[in-house]
């Protein structure tokens, strides 16, 4: 069932079918006997109650009140009252934009990012039963799609999808044709979730060892699911069998990014190597970024300011 | 409109320089890397390169090495890609594009390479 | 560098039958920390730049047909064009992004037969 009017202030466009459904309406029903009246009051004018004799635009169904369609001076405060129950709504009624197929300020904003499940469906569960056609329009252009009782569009959001939305339902009530447009501006942006992967820590580092000990350099990042993080060093990675890239460790952060390590372990040091340089380097589709390791043979220490050391 | 607008031809003799431009627009210029792509006459794709536009840095194929630079101006979104000591098997189409799996890709440059 | 190997050179198919190209990495472009292939398919018109058919081995670029389609994983890889159209005839690459310098095969050339 289609949910009460729970909104205190409604702005509606003039010209289409609308209706105001209170939100005690399942007490309404086991209250069958209890009398339940609408009112509205504009401006100076008291509370006037509402009743098909009203205007012939009106009509009461149970916990409905329908217009067809709703007009400019139907502006104005609703309210509903049942026993002790009370219901109000400010009600504001717009112009129709006469030169476009839809009005601005009945516009429903929303943002997708590119490459992101887009989708627009159009429904009207309210007035399904009576809808016997529905449009989508792209900027005040009928889209051409199979399904004409609901238009769909499902897919991965491309730049060129941004614009406006327009779902017009087309529906019969006594003999008459009414129309109800919901329209949406789509704005696509770039993918907002991805960040700059960072390599922590210092972008060269010296590190003193020994020969014949053993070294693990530890090269971490934070970044997204799809970004690589590796190393390279000589001429082909590989050559050495001293050296080996341990499996690569990620933990995810909070934020839902990547916080990875990948360790390069360096048995036996031998003077081969020795200051030469140890890349890690993690890339993305925004480009790379390395930090470089450099051994160093504990004895040459002094010749290094001590800042630059990593252990 | 999401785009990436390449310089106009070129004809370039042996042994000088040629500079190549593509200018970035609709998307924001420091989220993707900006790669170099040529194709010679009748042959395939040949990467040359890409620039990292947040932080500059730089990775270049290993033949090209010492003869190309790739930079980028970021009050311009725009990159550029410096070829020197053109030889004749320099002839061909340049192509910049977006990203690493390149999802944009300029019009193409063709610089012509003739004593 | 990692070598990227298409096969075959050159292939004629008939309009509306199933096209199938093959493109072979030297090493793994599959990356074990997040599960994801490094691996893109694009198609090349005479005079025009080539356009990203899919990514990540199998992901179809918005806007490409339903007909495209991408498998594989590791090091062996397959483009399939499920019913060929006219408009498909074209050079088709396939490319590495998982190390510098990111290599490409070097491209099938699709003709109708």
């Known amino acids: 069932a289609e949910s009460c009017t729970s909104r205190p202030h409604i702005t509606v466009v003039e010209g289409e079918p609308f209706y105001l459904k209170h939100c005690s309406c399942s007490l309404a029903h086991e209250i069958e006997t209890t009398t339940k009246s609408w009112y509205k009051s504009s401006g100076s004018q008291e509370h006037v109650e509402l009743n098909p004799r009203s205007s012939s635009r009106i009509a009461l169904h149970d916990c409905v009140l329908e217009f067809w369609p709703v007009e400019l001076n139907d502006t104005g405060s609703y309210f509903f009252q049942m026993k002790n129950y009370t219901q109000k709504w400010k009600l504001n009624v717009i112009r129709r934009n006469k030169h476009s197929c839809f009005t601005e300020r009945q516009v429903t904003s929303k943002i997708v990012e590119v490459k992101k499940f887009f989708q627009i469906t159009c429904e009207n569960s309210y007035y399904q039963t009576l809808v016997n056609s529905t449009s989508l329009y792209k900027n005040c252009k009928k889209l051409l799609l199979e399904n004409n009782k609901n238009p769909t569009i499902k897919k991965n959001a491309e730049f060129e999808d941004q614009g406006y939305y327009s779902c017009v339902h087309f529906l019969h009530h006594n003999g008459k044709l009414f129309n109800i447009t919901k329209t949406f501006n789509i704005t696509i942006v770039e993918d907002r979730s991805n960040i700059v992967p960072v390599l922590l820590g210092p972008k060269l580092n010296h590190v003193a060892v020994e020969l014949g000990k053993n070294v693990r350099l530890n090269c971490s990042a934070l970044l997204n699911e799809e970004d690589v993080i590796y190393w390279m060093f000589g001429e082909e990675n590989g050559s050495d069998p001293n050296i080996h890239e341990e499996k690569e460790m990620r933990i995810m952060t909070p934020e839902g990014k990547w916080h990875a390590s990948k360790v390069l372990r360096i048995e036996n040091i031998g003077e081969s190597n020795l200051n030469v340089l140890y890349n890690c380097t993690v890339a993305s589709t925004g480009g790379t970024d390395t930090k470089s390791f450099i051994l160093v043979r504990k004895a040459d220490m002094a010749d290094i300011p001590g800042h630059v050391f990593t252990r | 409109q999401v785009q990436l607008v390449q310089s106009g031809a070129e004809v370039k003799k042996p042994g000088a320089s040629v500079k190549v431009s593509c200018k970035a627009s609709g998307y924001t210029f420091t989220s993707y890397g900006i790669s170099w792509v040529r194709q010679a006459p009748g042959q395939g794709l040949e990467w040359m390169g890409w620039?990292?536009?947040?932080?500059?840095?730089?990775n270049y194929a290993q033949k090209l090495q010492g003869r190309v630079t790739m930079t980028t101006d970021t009050s311009t979104s725009t990159a550029y890609m410096e070829l020197r000591s053109l030889r004749s098997d320099d002839t061909a189409v340049y192509y910049c594009?977006?990203?690493?799996?390149?999802?944009?890709w300029g019009r193409g440059t063709l610089v012509t390479v003739s004593s | 560098d990692i070598v990227m190997t298409q096969s075959p050179d050159s292939l004629a198919v008939s309009l509306g039958e199933r096209a199938t190209i093959n493109c072979k990495s030297s090493?793994?472009?599959?990356?074990?920390?997040?599960?994801?292939?490094?691996l893109a398919w694009y198609q090349q018109k005479p005079g025009q730049p080539p356009k990203l058919l899919i990514y990540?081995?199998?992901t179809r670029e918005s806007g490409v047909p339903d007909r495209f389609s991408g498998s594989g994983s590791g090091t062996d890889f397959t483009l399939t064009i499920s019913s060929l159209q006219a408009e498909d005839v074209a050079v088709y690459y396939c490319?590495?992004?998982?190390?510098?310098?990111?290599?490409f095969g070097q491209g099938t050339k699709l003709e109708i037969k």
């Open positions: 594009a977006r990203g690493w799996y390149f999802d944009l």
């Open positions: 990540w081995a199998s």
């Open positions: 090493q793994t472009v599959l990356y074990s920390s997040n599960n994801k292939t490094y």
């Open positions: 490319q590495q992004y998982y190390r510098t310098p990111y290599t």
């Open positions: 620039i990292s536009v947040y932080n500059g840095n730089t």
